[in-house]
């Protein structure tokens, strides 16, 4: 089938992928790669987990869900047209020929250009407020879009929220691993 996941330039894209850990904390290695799943592994790896943690990821790619419960859905931050294409989520189940392979097609569309009559709208168009609920990122709620009633005193608060939510993700996923990119 040719099902497509969609996002606009500048948004975050969400590519869902799930598996059932055999027991809580008994994780299976997972890799995400750009390009269709090859026979083994993932090509052009953008993120990888091991039996304990996320052990490799490149800038803009992260897991926002509870990967310790098997939610290994990929978030791609601030997408560009170049992010369009097929992505492979590979659940690397131990044993011969046990891997589950998912090929997800991502289509990036140009951002809708809307008139920006006030400076407040300029800000919110540049910084759409992101949902930070862990593990929830369906397409229709990836961003809350412009917040027309925002006032200038809220701008620094919103900027801090954006920074802090990303930092929280970084801290949660990093463990003792090295940040790449």
């Amino acid at each position: 089938s040719e099902v497509e996941y969609r996002a606009e330039v500048g948004q975050n894209a969400y590519l869902p992928c799930f598996y059932t850990p055999a027991a809580p904390g008994n994780l299976v290695p997972v890799c995400w790669g750009k390009g269709a799943c090859p026979v083994f592994e993932c090509g052009n790896v953008v993120l990888r987990t091991d039996e304990r943690d996320v052990n490799y990821w490149t800038s803009r790619y992260w897991l926002n869900g509870d990967f310790r419960k098997g939610d290994v859905s990929l978030t791609i931050e601030n997408v560009t047209l170049a992010d369009s294409g097929i992505y492979c989520c590979r659940i690397q189940i131990p044993g011969i020929m046990n891997d589950e392979k998912f090929n997800l097609k991502l289509v990036i569309k140009p951002a809708k250009v809307t008139p920006a009559p006030t400076r407040q709208r300029d800000f919110t168009a540049a910084f759409p407020r992101m949902l930070t609920t862990r593990g929830h990122g369906p397409a229709e709620t990836q961003t809350l879009g412009s917040l027309p009633d925002i006032n200038l005193t809220q701008i620094s608060t919103l900027a801090n929220e954006l920074r802090d939510s990303r930092l929280a993700n970084d801290l949660r996923d990093s463990g003792a691993t090295i940040r790449i990119g």
Epitope: S1, V3, C17, N98, K101, F102, G137
Partner: antibody, heavy 119, light 107 residues
Framework: EVQLQQSGPELVKPGASVKMSCKAS????????MNWVKQSHGKSLEWIGR????????NNNQNFKGKATLTVDKSLNTAYMQLNSLTSEDSAVYYC????????????WGQGTLVTVSA | DIVMTQSHKFMSTSVGDRVSITCKAS??????VVWYQQKPGQSPKILIF???YRYTGVPDRFTGSGSGTEFTFTISSVQAEDLAVYYC?????????FGGGTKLEIR
């Protein structure tokens, strides 16, 4: 075009066993697990389990442990489900189903095999 | 096991009406929910996945939304051919489980 062709209806006696088949075509059989789903008359759907055509490995719903045995014949591109010690509770339509390439939802279904358990 | 609850077993509607069917999961299933349509005498057919994307070839009057534990399936303008049973299913955890189904009846 992906197709799943199931065997015909079965009328069986209580205590007996039945083995139904699901022949796959239109894709590489070993690339996807085959799933089995039960639907009792007028009722909802229950996932029974799945079998890996590459190596015969299975994941079963615990509710069907000892009831359903899932196997494959790679050379025939066919999956099988055997139901043992049948009772009236096992009277149902049984579907084989294959997931989509991009996620674990069932995009392809067989037409179903009706099993009737009656003395 | 995760229990998927569809609160209405039956819903009666008229052609052209908007109708929404809800599904609640007994625990957080993130976005791992899909919706199927089953017409009388037929196999189920996938309509919505992830849980707001229409499957290939599905008319745009069918939409879905939700995340976590609460999900909604909507038909914006019911047609006569929409007479069917609609099921939600979670694929977050094995065993994958289905809702009890909601039968849409056309008045």
């Amino acid at each position: 075009e992906v197709q799943l062709q199931q065997s015909g209806p079965e009328l069986v006696k209580p205590g007996a066993s039945v083995k139904m088949s699901c022949k796959a075509s239109g894709y590489t059989f070993t690339d996807y697990y085959m799933n089995w789903v039960k639907q009792s008359h007028g009722k909802s759907l229950e996932w029974i389990g799945r079998v890996n055509p590459s190596n015969g490995g299975t994941n079963n719903n615990q509710n069907f442990k000892g009831k359903a045995t899932l196997t494959v014949d790679k050379s025939l591109n066919t999956a099988y489900m055997q139901l043992n010690s049948l009772t009236s509770e096992d009277s149902a339509v049984y579907y084989c189903a294959r997931r989509d390439s991009s996620g674990y939802w069932f995009a392809y279904w067989g037409q179903g095999t009706l099993v009737t358990v009656s003395a | 096991d995760i229990v998927m609850t569809q609160s209405h077993k039956f819903m009666s509607t008229s052609v052209g009406d908007r109708v929404s069917i809800t599904c609640k999961a007994s625990q957080d299933v993130s976005t791992a929910v899909v919706w199927y349509q089953q017409k009388p005498g037929q196999s189920p057919k996938i309509l919505i996945f992830s849980p707001s994307y229409r499957y290939t070839g599905v008319p745009d009057r069918f939409t879905g939304s939700g995340s976590g534990t609460e999900f909604t399936f909507t038909i914006s303008s019911v047609q006569a051919e929409d007479l069917a049973v609609y099921y939600c299913q979670q694929h977050y955890n094995i065993p994958w489980t289905f809702g009890g189904g909601t039968k849409l009846e056309i008045r």
